[in-house]
Interface confidence: medium
């Protein structure tokens, strides 16, 4: 009966691929007599004329290649390997990721304004959604030589924290310990990606015990 020659490399059942890229499904097999391979998409016979751009079937490599994948290529792809003594099959799932990037989105209502007692600890919370890797910053408005804005009208700010987020959804926190009156004022949670910027201003008021 047919058998897989690289079963340890066939455990990746889901391929999530950005649109426009190339996908190859492979089911390396052997048997005596040499088995044949055929392909199904969502349980039905799959042939080149079933997709724009066609497909490449490489029987010697036990593979199916699709170039420039599009969302309609999503589905379950099954290789069926058989000879007169039996058949084996493997199913891969293809997800095609569409690229419709947008500027970051900040969850409404966060961060919230807070009032704190002198010497206490305060934590602000900002939730960022971005399909493109965002640069996230916590900023505080400051005065320079008694002025809140520069000559070009841009507010003076100091960067408290800055990093690139690896995730699509970032739950970020700014912790201020042992606050003093100096910590009072206007702050910003800002997220930037290559599409644009999103920011939310919030206030911290500090008062005596």
């Amino acid at each position: 009966a047919p058998y897989w020659t690289r079963p340890e490399r066939m455990d990746k059942k889901l391929l999530a691929v950005p649109a426009a890229n190339t996908v190859r499904f492979a089911c390396p097999a052997a048997g005596n007599p040499t088995p044949s391979i055929s392909w199904l998409k969502n349980g039905r016979e799959f042939r080149g004329e079933h997709r724009i751009g066609g497909i490449k079937l490489r029987h010697q490599q036990w593979s199916l290649v699709m170039e420039s994948v599009v969302p309609s290529d999503r589905g379950n792809y099954t290789c069926v390997v058989e000879n007169k003594f039996g058949s084996i099959r493997q199913t891969y799932t293809l997800d095609v990721l569409e690229r419709s990037p947008h500027r970051p989105i900040l969850q409404a209502g966060l961060p919230a304004n807070q009032t704190a007692v002198l010497g206490s600890d305060v934590e602000f919370h900002c939730k960022v959604y971005s399909d493109a890797q965002p640069h996230i910053q916590w900023l505080k408005h400051v005065e320079v030589n008694g002025s809140k804005v520069g000559p070009d009208g841009t507010p003076y700010v100091t960067v408290l924290k800055s990093w690139i987020s690896e995730s699509v959804e970032a739950d970020v926190r700014l912790r201020l310990a042992n606050v003093s009156e100096r910590d009072g004022g206007e702050y910003l949670c800002r997220a930037t990606n290559f599409i644009g910027v999103a920011e939310k201003a919030f206030w911290l008021s500090v008062h005596g015990p």
Epitope: A20, N21, T22, V23, R24, Q61, Y92, R99, A132, N193
Partner: antibody, heavy 126, light 109 residues
Framework: EVQLVQSGAEVKKPGASVKVSCKAS????????ISWVRQAPGQGLEWMGW????????NYAQKFQGRVTVTTDTSTSTAYMELRSLRSEDTAVYYC???????????????????WGQGTTVTVSS | QSVLTQPPSLSVAPGKTATFTCGGN??????VHWYRQKPGQAPVLVMY???ERPSGIPERMSGSNFGNTATLTITRVEAEDEADYYC???????????FGGGTKLTVLG
Amino acid sequence: EVQLVQSGAEVKKPGASVKVSCKASGYMFTSYGISWVRQAPGQGLEWMGWVSTYNGDTNYAQKFQGRVTVTTDTSTSTAYMELRSLRSEDTAVYYCARVLGYYDSIDGYYYGMDVWGQGTTVTVSS
Amino acid sequence: QSVLTQPPSLSVAPGKTATFTCGGNNIGDKSVHWYRQKPGQAPVLVMYLDTERPSGIPERMSGSNFGNTATLTITRVEAEDEADYYCQVWDSGSDHVVFGGGTKLTVLG
């Protein structure tokens, strides 16, 4: 027709910087990354770095880290490569190339370069 | 970081077969791409994922990749095949592109 068209030849003095542009046409710019590869006279291909046109991520070869910056302008479908602190050994032809992702169920993901610019000659000489 | 080794030169008579090799530790576990570069021109992708020919590349070209050696084969070599041939892998550990040193094909006669 899918094309990458690069800016013209440059002659620079040692210590200067050079910025080479690469304008893409004939395809959706943000669907493919851009790699930069250089070739010194009589030498082989040397990869410098790449940029994701989708999210601006960059990755540079160790040799060029800190001296090269690769950027993109999605509004004009143009990629840029800036090389600073030039020395005579930087004399080369600089190529941009479209990066295509190949996803393989057995071997995982791999990237290759399926379309290349015509090359920009940069000469560094005092 | 992957290191790819290619012989610097290869000479073949017209009509014969040219075999380019690209050596690397367990390269068979990676996917290899091949580029052809004619004098004064930009490189052109001629083979991807070890065995796949881009459109416009003749069937005379084929590829394989096993163990520690990837191979690009051109049958019925013609004068127009004279060029430098480079192998390339993607080092997924470092997200870096790695090229072999290239092989110069000379077509005799």
